[in-house]
């Protein structure tokens, strides 16, 4: 969480941002909130990006003002106009690109004063893994697949029964470049698995950590997966 204060002759206002990560090809949100004003026409929101000449987005006098918008953001940004009055200056970003990563500044002017806060935005690719029993294999084998990751992640297997065991000798992980030549499909195979055990396939890069669990018994197979973004800090 980053909290910024204004430093002008006017009173300063508190502006709060949250560091976040964008998934390439998906839409992203750059979060920013501020002390609200009672008049929409008195609020100015400017989003800027370090190293970029034009503005990312500007909203003032109750409407978007994009005449100074940088080319890399054209047609890709929007504020939640109906939520500006309650202090939400968050920015929606369409079709996140690797090059959108960087330091952004959310700069606010209201009748109460000015304030700003920076936001670190990371970009990459992350997806939920799915673990299945590979019935085509000669021995009991598990296959963990996740369709889109970038940068290249690490894959670690764990088991509930053999806690702390190192499965690197009995697993094989491959990375296959997807058609857009950036993200990769992750496939990891674990051999010699035993019945009545829960196995976890953990995929992690510097942006996200995802886990796919599978519990294999003689009567059923249960699956569960979850994904967590790393380094979501507020400012």
């Amino acid at each position: 969480l980053i909290i910024g204060f204004g430093i002008s002759g006017r009173h300063s206002i508190t502006v709060t941002t949250v560091a976040s990560a964008g998934n390439i090809g998906e839409d992203g949100i750059l979060s920013c909130t501020f002390e609200p004003d009672i008049k929409l026409s008195d609020i100015v929101i400017q989003w800027l990006k370090e190293g970029v000449l034009g503005l990312v987005h500007e909203f003032k006098e109750g409407k978007d003002e994009l005449s100074e918008q940088d080319e890399m953001f054209r047609g890709r940004t929007a504020v939640f106009a109906d939520q500006v009055i309650v202090g939400n200056a968050s920015l929606r970003l369409k079709n996140v690109q690797l090059t959108d990563a960087g330091t952004y500044k959310c700069y606010i002017i209201t009748s109460k004063g000015k304030g700003n806060a920076n936001l670190e935005y990371k970009t990459g690719a992350f997806s939920m893994p799915e673990v299945n029993v590979d019935y085509n294999a000669s021995s009991e084998t598990l296959r963990c697949e996740a369709p889109r990751w970038f940068p290249q992640p690490t894959v670690v297997w764990a088991s509930q029964v053999d806690q702390g065991a190192n499965f690197s000798e009995v697993s094989n992980t491959s990375f296959e470049l997807n058609s857009e030549n950036v993200t990769m499909k992750v496939v990891s195979v674990l051999y010699n698995v035993t019945i009545n055990n829960t196995y976890s396939c953990m995929i992690e890069n510097d942006i996200a950590k995802a886990t796919g669990d599978i519990k294999v018994t003689e009567s059923e197979i249960k699956r569960r997966s979850h994904l967590q973004l790393l380094n979501s800090k507020a400012s």
Epitope: E65, S67, A78
Partner: antibody
Framework: QIQLQESGPGLVQPSQSLSITCTVS????????VQWVRQSPGKGLEWLGV???????DYNAAFISRLSISKDNSKSQVFFKMNSLQADDTAIYYC?????????????WGQGTLVTVSA | NIVMTQSPKSMSMSVGERVTLRCKAS??????VSWYQQKPEQSPKLLIY???NRYTGVPDRFTGSGSATDFTLTISSVQAEDLADYHC?????????FGSGTKLEIK
Amino acid sequence: QIQLQESGPGLVQPSQSLSITCTVSGFSLTSYGVQWVRQSPGKGLEWLGVIWSSGSTDYNAAFISRLSISKDNSKSQVFFKMNSLQADDTAIYYCARDITTIVEGFAYWGQGTLVTVSA
Amino acid sequence: NIVMTQSPKSMSMSVGERVTLRCKASENVNTYVSWYQQKPEQSPKLLIYGASNRYTGVPDRFTGSGSATDFTLTISSVQAEDLADYHCGQSYSYPFTFGSGTKLEIK
């Protein structure tokens, strides 16, 4: 009330150029981009290009060599010019505006101007 | 270029029937698909944007769904005034592209 209105020549000689003006009201050209789309007789819609609030443009690669879009913010007018027209450029030409500043649907359309390319 | 393939090309339905129009993108377009209704001699009108968001004033019998490559426009109970051409379009990547349209006729 948001409105867009095209005005064009109707008839264009083969190999000549086409100029259409789109006059908008109810919104500012510094807030929203304006898209251009055409529809040939009995055919589907074809996206031609866009001019953004900043004045920068994006064109359909199939038309980039003969298409130019410009605007005058103060007059709320967008200018569309296409060169070297042939018979298969006969179509209704529309200007349109997106629903938001992110392109996710063309919510407002002009009435369209029918352009016939014929000697 | 992303190709948007619409099906069927045309269909004839009775008032009150349920209509399903399909649009398939040649590659992933996330949810950046919109649906338009075009009546004879009129400009297209936006029905659905963002794959599933009904535009202001559009009757709730029109519903959009889908993501990535497969999209559907459903008219739950077709009315006589729904006689029109229906177009899908993608605005995920340049050049923006449209399907060739579905002509809906009322029996």
